[in-house]
């Protein structure tokens, strides 16, 4: 039974050519956590895995940084980095887990962060 | 240099059994997932089995589930696949692969025969 | 079970032809779409993986796009070492599958 719970950084806004992190957490389970895979929209952005470290898609390699932990930072961000993101937590021998996190860049220098949320 | 190499292949009856090795070189083996995939002759490609790294998590195509067993030994560097209750339509090269994050095979073995007839 | 469909099943063309290989599967895998190429009596080989990564040592001639159900592999200029049969391939979900292949040949 799948008892875990993932924590975002919820809906959250940056500035046009700022940077951001995206984090999720996995609590309330004992699994083991054998990898995350970071998704925008349909595209894959990113790997952790517990045995090969990180991977990064190629074509995301110079707006993409691993980390912090499973979390993944992006720079230089532009208006098209809009929408949502997902953390794929692949666990032993829970299953897989998926956070959600929409990003807003803003032209305006005003960017705020949304509340904290969890997905069951 | 990554190296694959597939062996234990032949021709075998019916009911039968047989047992595939994959010697693994040139990388870490136990960080990646491995996986099995066969191609009968003049056909496409067909995934048969996983194995995944951390966990020793296995998976299996419903068509050998309950006949084919994959494991792994680590110490050894090597791939294993456990055929029993083979059939004709097990006739096939069977390659190993390499699986990096569990999304792609970047390495494949030259692959080993298998036959399955009376 | 994820059912991938290759088009066209075998096409010909010559060397500089640019060709489009199109896979869809029965349902969305995001971008966890693979190409494999595949020569008579050989082992297949990674070409693209994650719809449009282009593997290491893979000539930039090979390109792939698409997500979610829809998916290309383009040759830019065709190679006669290019005269192959190639396989998308998904990892969304197991079992993994692939296509039925397509097959390159001279015209």
């Known amino acids: 039974m799948m008892t875990g719970t993932i924590e975002t950084t919820g809906n959250i806004s940056a500035e046009k050519g700022g940077s951001i992190i995206l984090q999720c957490h996995l609590s309330s389970t004992t699994a083991q956590v054998t990898q995350v895979n970071w998704e925008q929209q349909d595209q894959l952005l990113a790997i952790c895995n517990a045995d090969l470290g990180w991977h990064i898609s190629p074509s995301f390699k110079d707006r993409v940084a691993p980390g912090p932990g499973l979390g993944l930072t992006l720079q230089s961000l532009t208006v098209n980095d809009t929408g949502e993101y997902f953390c794929i937590y692949h666990t032993y021998p829970d299953g897989t887990y998926t956070g959600r996190i929409f990003l807003e860049v803003l032209e305006s220098s005003v960017a705020e962060h949304g509340a904290r949320f969890q997905i069951p | 240099e990554v190296q694959l190499l597939e062996s234990g292949g032949g021709l075998v009856q019916p009911g039968g059994s047989l047992r595939l090795s994959c010697a693994a070189s040139?990388?870490?083996?136990?960080?990646?997932?491995m996986s099995w995939v066969r191609q009968a002759p003049g056909k496409g490609l067909e995934w048969v089995s996983s194995i995944k790294s951390n966990t020793g998590s296995t998976y299996y195509a419903d068509s050998v589930k309950g006949r084919f067993t994959i494991s792994r030994d680590n110490s050894k560097n090597t791939l294993y696949l456990q055929m029993n209750s083979l059939r004709a339509e097990d006739t096939a090269v069977y390659y190993c692969?390499?699986?990096?994050?569990?999304?792609?095979?970047?390495?494949w073995g030259q692959g080993t025969l298998v036959t399955v007839s009376s | 079970d994820i059912q991938m469909t290759q088009s066209p099943s075998s096409l010909s063309a010559s060397v500089g032809d640019r060709v489009t290989i199109t896979c869809r599967a029965s349902q969305s895998i995001s971008s966890y779409l693979n190409w494999y190429q595949q020569k008579p009596g050989k082992a297949p080989k990674l070409l693209i993986y994650a719809a449009s990564s282009l593997q290491s040592g893979v000539p930039s001639r090979f390109s792939g796009s698409g997500s979610g159900t829809d998916f290309t592999l383009t040759i830019s200029s065709l190679q006669p070492e290019d005269f192959a049969t190639y396989y998308c391939q998904q990892s969304y979900s197991t079992p993994l599958t692939f296509g039925g292949g397509t097959k390159v040949e001279i015209k």
């Open positions: 692969a390499r699986e990096p994050y569990s999304v792609w095979l970047d390495y």
């Open positions: 040139g990388f870490t083996f136990s960080s990646y997932a």
